[in-house]
């Protein structure tokens, strides 16, 4: 607890101190008082620099004095023989003896007092920026006219903050200008312009005249810009150091000026206008400005246009351009928007073909599409090759943005038929050399794939069964083998206008127009064991003449047995109808003359007993393309015959290929065309 | 050359079991049905149970059915036919035949064209 | 089940007679039936399948006919190797039944 006075006695005092004692006082007085500490009796073993015995006093860090020896007072009025005056509230005083005397030593006594301090002469440091008044106990500030005391109740400064400009123009300039400005102070001046304006300060070189930098290059009195989080300066010296024209990017700006005690100059003067934000004019690759300007300012507006194979994307819709506003921040609006390279996105996949997975969908790539070779080729053309186009689609020379579309190569079996005796007379075959080859088991009978969605037959076969089960890709039809072949399900039977329908259809003399269509549910897969044979052409090239050879197959009849279980094959010539004719035939249903004969059926066999049978109906007669030797075409139809092993009746195929292509487009579905 | 080899018969008690085999060569075996038909000494010939290519259908006559039952292994080229709760009039000689199967959804049986030479089975306390 | 009826139960002959054996079924079988000759101590073998079509390798001495319900195996002119039980196989539904079997022995 600080007190105004005491005393500080050595021990055993006025006896002989102790050997070996070190004994310290921390004496304090009230704040705003120093200490005068006095010795009226001083009696320590002298030693040089004290260094046996002494009292030492300290003040703060720094030692005040340390003393030793017998000492008497100058002044016979005073008895004071050592004396200390420290203007602080602090002090300490130790005491050190050390394990000896020779003589016997008395010590000392002292004491002090709370006295008095000048804060305003006794320190290097001048508590007052400008007038200093002592009191006992303390000391207190006061500023000239005009000055205001800070809140730290040492400095004095003039009232110069606070102004607030908002007009798009203005001057300021410092206190007193062009008169010196005051010391010690710090003027804050606000410019809060509307956004979209940016403050733009201009000052003349002469109009500035600031207290200039030491010589470590620190400005002692400063006039510094804030804009945001730049800033522009501190500026001093006599001429404006900084541009003339600071363009601070910004509607709001802060005027800092702060001085020193020292160095009073005429201070400065600055102009200051809004200009609508600049916002820059960006580089955005692959695009188009309009309008073109050399300057954009707030609320300008422009329609960002990409090039040709660039959009812009947006969430998940692409356009081809958008609008940016220049903004009161001095930046352009939808800025993230880019004009990117236009993607086509991965190429559609086609059915019966494939396209390559494309390194790039993006504008300018290329894809080349292709059919599964040898089954299917590219019926409209163009190449399969697509490119990327600027519209976002993938885009053939030929057909622009319309797939390819791979269809069936038709009557190509991938093994030739080689005779080796069976069918009636016929060979064993396999259905690689038929692959066309149909097989209905109710009833036991043949058709013949024409395409994916259609197989050809006999009208005789479907029309005690409208709904057929089919099989390709088996030469052999054990129950075993077709479980694991293709069934194909039909959709509709399209049996021919002409044909005449019976009440009892196994009384049947005329077979005329013995041709049906069945549409399929779904469509066939080709490959080396299914696919279809070619219609035949409308020319004269399609007429067959006499001799001319045609293949047939199926499961039918043999001379071993009633169903063959694999397939057989013959290499049939075509002859004369009347040839057919001459036949008797074999287990007449009726009269041998009503048997009818027309120019819609060929005549065909007769060679080696080679022929069809019961169970081969509708089941091609294949003969070559005399314009494509590598094809096969469907001449004709296994319909009827007088006697199996002479000659058959055969539908004569080019008389309803009109029929064919017209029942075929009518009753197509939109995935076929 | 097409065989069939029956296999498993025997003297076996009433009531009691016997598992007969049919070993199948000389033809694809899972192409075609299977059939077993006896003889009893001196009698005519009775079919007992058909079993289709791939084992997915089976027949039965009257008499032995839910004692008897058909089965294959195609990967094996075997046919069987376990017999159980057996009873003297079972006395017999059993023959497997093979059936061929033509046709898809409407088929064509074609039954018995080739037979085995048959293994006997003795039912007799 | 379909019954099969066979007759006569037995016969004898000549070499060289025309023989006749009849079945008939208890209900209409279409043409789902087949011949079978069985010689004694031998194996049952196909002549006839799907009422008259000749098994591959028999003599064309055999022959069949017939749909519905009555079915008839005629052997043209016998031969002494045609000595033999011949027995008729309905296949047209489960389960398949034989007809009792007619023995042709020498006259």
């Known amino acids: 607890e600080p007190t105004m006075y005491g005393e500080i006695l050595s021990p055993n005092y006025p006896q002989a101190y102790p050997s070996e004692v070190e004994k310290s006082w921390d004496i304090e007085v009230p704040e705003g008082y120093g200490i005068h500490l006095y010795f009226t009796h001083l009696d320590i073993e002298l030693s040089e620099n004290c260094a046996y015995d002494s009292v030492q006093i300290i003040s703060g860090d720094t030692e005040e004095g340390r003393l030793c020896g017998q000492r008497s007072s100058n002044n016979p009025h005073s008895p004071i023989v050592e004396e200390f005056q420290v203007p602080y509230n602090k002090l300490q005083v130790i005491f050190k003896s050390d394990f000896s005397n020779e003589e016997r030593f008395t010590g000392f006594a002292a004491y002090y007092v709370a006295t008095d301090i000048n804060e305003c002469t006794d320190f290097v440091d001048v508590p007052c920026s400008h007038f200093c008044n002592n009191f006992i106990g303390g000391y207190f500030c006061s500023c000239p006219p005009e000055y205001f005391l800070h809140d730290d109740m040492k400095n004095c400064g003039v009232n110069c903050s606070g102004d607030v400009f908002t007009a798009l123009i203005g001057e300021i300039a410092s206190p007193n200008y062009p008169k010196p400005y005051p010391e010690n102070s710090r003027c804050e001046y606000q410019i809060r312009l509307e956004k979209g304006f940016q403050v733009v300060v201009t000052l003349r070189r002469e109009d500035f005249d600031v207290e200039a930098a030491d010589s470590a290059g620190n400005c002692l009195d400063s006039l510094v810009f804030v804009a945001g989080d730049r800033q522009f300066g501190p500026y001093c010296g006599h001429g404006f150091p900084g541009p003339l024209n600071i363009e601070t990017k910004s509607n709001a700006l802060d005027i800092i000026f702060q001085t020193d005690l020292t160095g009073q100059k005429k201070g400065w003067k600055l102009r200051y206008h809004g200009d609508p934000m600049p916002c820059p004019k960006e580089d955005t690759p692959n695009s188009v400005w309009e309008p073109a300007k050399a300057k954009y300012v707030f609320r300008d507006v422009v329609q960002i246009t990409c090039l040709d194979g660039f959009e812009v994307v947006e969430g998940r819709v692409g356009a081809t351009s958008f609008y940016s506003t220049c903004q009161s921040n001095g930046k352009w609006s939808n800025s993230k928007l880019k004009c990117q390279p236009v993607d086509c996105g991965i190429p559609e996949s086609i059915e019966n073909g494939k396209v390559e997975d494309p390194e790039s969908t993006l504008f300018g790539s290329v894809i080349r599409y292709t059919c599964e070779e040898p089954y299917y080729y590219m019926e409209n053309g163009g190449g399969g090759e697509y490119h990327c186009a600027g519209n976002g689609s993938w885009v053939n020379e030929v057909l622009g943005p319309e797939l390819p579309k791979c269809v069936p190569v038709c009557g190509v079996p991938r093994e030739p038929f080689e005779e080796k005796q069976r069918i009636i007379g016929g060979s064993d075959a396999d259905i690689k050399n038929f692959p066309w080859q149909v097989f209905f088991d109710n009833p036991w009978a043949g058709g013949a794939l024409i395409n994916e969605y259609w197989v050809l037959t006999a009208a005789h076969v479907v029309e005690g069964n409208r709904e057929p089960t089919m099989y390709v890709g088996s030469t052999s039809v054990q129950t075993s083998r077709l479980a694991k072949s293709k069934m194909l399900t039909p959709e509709h039977v399209f049996i021919h206008p002409g044909w005449k329908l019976l009440e009892v259809p196994e009384g049947r003399t005329n077979f005329d127009n013995d041709i049906a269509l069945v549409r399929l549910k779904d469509p066939v897969k080709m490959g080396p064991t299914v696919s279809p044979i070619c219609l035949p052409g409308t020319s004269s090239d399609y007429n067959l003449m006499d001799g001319d050879l045609g293949l047939i197959s199926g499961w039918g009849r043999t001379e071993k047995r009633d169903r063959a279980v694999r397939l057989k094959a013959a290499r049939l010539p075509v002859a004369p109808l009347r040839k057919c004719k001459e036949v008797k035939v074999e287990k007449p249903t009726a009269d041998a003359e009503a048997y009818v004969f027309t120019p819609n059926m060929i005549c065909a066999g007769g060679e080696k007993g080679m022929d069809s049978c019961k169970g081969d109906s509708g089941g091609a007669f294949a003969v070559q393309d005399p314009n494509d030797k590598t094809k096969f075409y469907a001449a004709g139809l296994v319909s009827w015959g007088p006697q199996c092993g002479t000659y058959g009746l055969y539908t004569r195929v080019k008389n309803y290929v009109d029929w064919i292509m017209k029942t075929m487009q009518e009753n197509s579905t939109p995935r076929e065309d | 050359e097409v065989q069939l080899v029956e296999s498993g018969g025997g003297v076996v008690r009433p009531g009691g079991s016997l598992r007969l085999s049919c070993a199948a060569s000389?033809?694809?075996?899972?192409?075609?049905?299977m059939s077993w038909v006896r003889q009893a000494p001196g009698k005519g010939l009775e079919w007992v149970s058909g079993?289709?290519?791939?084992?997915?259908?089976?027949g039965y006559a009257d008499s032995v059915k839910g004692r008897f039952s058909i089965s294959r292994d195609n990967a094996k080229n075997s046919l069987y036919l376990q017999m159980n709760s057996l009873r003297a009039e079972d006395t017999a000689l059993y023959y497997c035949a093979r059936d061929e199967q033509l046709g898809g959804l409407k088929y064509y049986y074609y039954y018995m064209d080739v037979w085995g030479k048959g293994t006997t089975v003795t039912v007799s306390s | 089940d379909i019954q099969m009826t066979q007759s006569p139960s037995s016969l004898s002959a000549s070499v060289g007679d025309r023989v006749t054996i009849t079945c008939r079924a208890s209900q209409g079988i279409r043409n789902d039936l087949g011949w079978y000759q069985q010689k004694p101590g031998k194996a049952p073998k196909r002549l006839i399948y799907t009422a008259s079509n000749l098994q591959s390798g028999v003599p064309s001495r055999f022959s069949g006919s017939g749909s519905g319900t009555e079915f008839t195996l005629t052997i043209s002119s016998l031969q002494p190797e045609d000595f033999a039980t011949y027995y008729c196989?309905?296949?047209?539904?489960?389960?398949?039944?034989f007809g009792g079997g007619t023995k042709v022995e020498i006259k």
């Open positions: 000389g033809f694809t075996f899972d192409d075609y049905g």
């Open positions: 196989l309905q296949t047209n539904i489960y389960p398949l039944t």
């Open positions: 079993i289709n290519w791939e084992g997915g259908s089976t």
